[in-house]
Amino acid sequence: SVRVEQVVKPPQNKTESENTSDKPKRKKKGGKNGKNRRNRKKKNPCNAEFQNFCIHGECKYIEHLEAVTCKCQQEYFGERCGEKSMK
């Protein structure tokens, strides 16, 4: 079954015009390593106030949801990948 995780909304401290762009800055899914992506004007909260948010995992900013989530390392789970599975 599909697990829908919690996401955390970063505080809104920018104006809409400062934040708006044409393309997201998440990783390209095709096989081109994202080299055709343009430079981004927006700041990724994962590099700022959420840089230490994911304890045992990688912080990901989801632009569509204006929220951060964690991609946990193996054996870890939870909103911040702070819990270890007992396997």
């Epitope: 599909v2 708006t20 393309k23 390209k28 899914k29 994202g34 989801i62 632009e63 949801l65």
Partner: antibody, heavy 125, light 112 residues
């Protein structure tokens, strides 16, 4: 019941402007990204614009960039599309659509899970 | 931009038989084993309706005769057994992270 209802379509001359609205009901509007998708007279589907949950991020294809502006009013549960410098090739049925999504293991997968009935835009002199 | 090519453009299938629709992407729509491709059904005078998301997940409430498969650049929508109400046009759509979010050209299914 989850519903989207578009309005504002009509006949407009080339170079003219039009503003479409989409009223949402039956779900928590500010929890979903939203898009406009159009269908040409040849029945081709074309993505037109997307806006994030709070309106901070907007996305457009090159064909409408600089001419169309997507916006939302979460207090009114309404999505908008301001269209200017309209061209004959913008003639289409315009749908608003909700981005359903899966979020798991750090992955975000989305799809258009709810569509409105559409509003017709005709650009002709 | 990722181009999605559907084939055939139209097909006629006998009641109770299998309909197979192909969608080929100009580059991979996979990332880390996840396929970012969706299928929609559209009947005349109606908006498109979500059928399959993430390549193989059937939208809730829809009959199990619809199934999706594939990965990378090659995807397939199967309908079996086909019923009268399945007469419609079917579209694939990719939802990778970088816009534009493109659709295939559509496949019109006729029931014989």
């Amino acid at each position: 019941e989850v519903q989207l209802q578009e309005s504002g379509g009509g006949l407009v001359k080339p170079g003219g402007s039009l503003k479409l609205s989409c009223a949402a009901s039956g779900f928590t509007f500010n929890s979903y990204a939203m898009s406009w998708v159009r269908q040409t007279p040849e029945k081709r589907l074309e993505w037109v614009a997307t806006i994030s949950t709070g309106g901070s991020h907007t996305y457009y294809p090159d064909s409408v960039k600089g001419r169309f502006t997507i916006s939302r009013d979460n207090a009114k549960n309404t999505l908008y599309l301001q269209m200017s410098s309209l061209r004959s090739e913008d003639t289409a049925m315009y749908y608003c659509a909700r981005h359903g999504y899966l979020l798991y293991d750090g992955y975000y997968e989305w799809y258009f899970d709810v569509w409105g009935a559409g509003t017709t835009v005709t650009v002709s002199s | 931009d990722i181009v999605l090519t559907q084939s055939p453009a139209s097909l006629a299938v006998s009641l109770g038989q299998r309909a197979t629709i192909s969608c080929k992407a100009s580059q991979s729509v996979d990332y880390d084993g996840h396929s970012f491709l969706n299928w929609y059904q559209q009947k005349p005078g109606q908006p498109p309706k979500l059928l399959i998301y993430a390549a193989s997940n059937l939208e809730s409430g829809l009959p199990a005769r619809f199934s999706g498969s594939g990965s990378g650049t090659d995807f397939t929508l199967n309908i079996h057994p086909v019923e009268e109400e399945d007469a419609a046009t079917y579209y694939c759509q990719q939802s990778t992270e970088d816009p534009p979010y493109t659709f295939g050209g559509g496949t019109k299914l006729e029931i014989k």
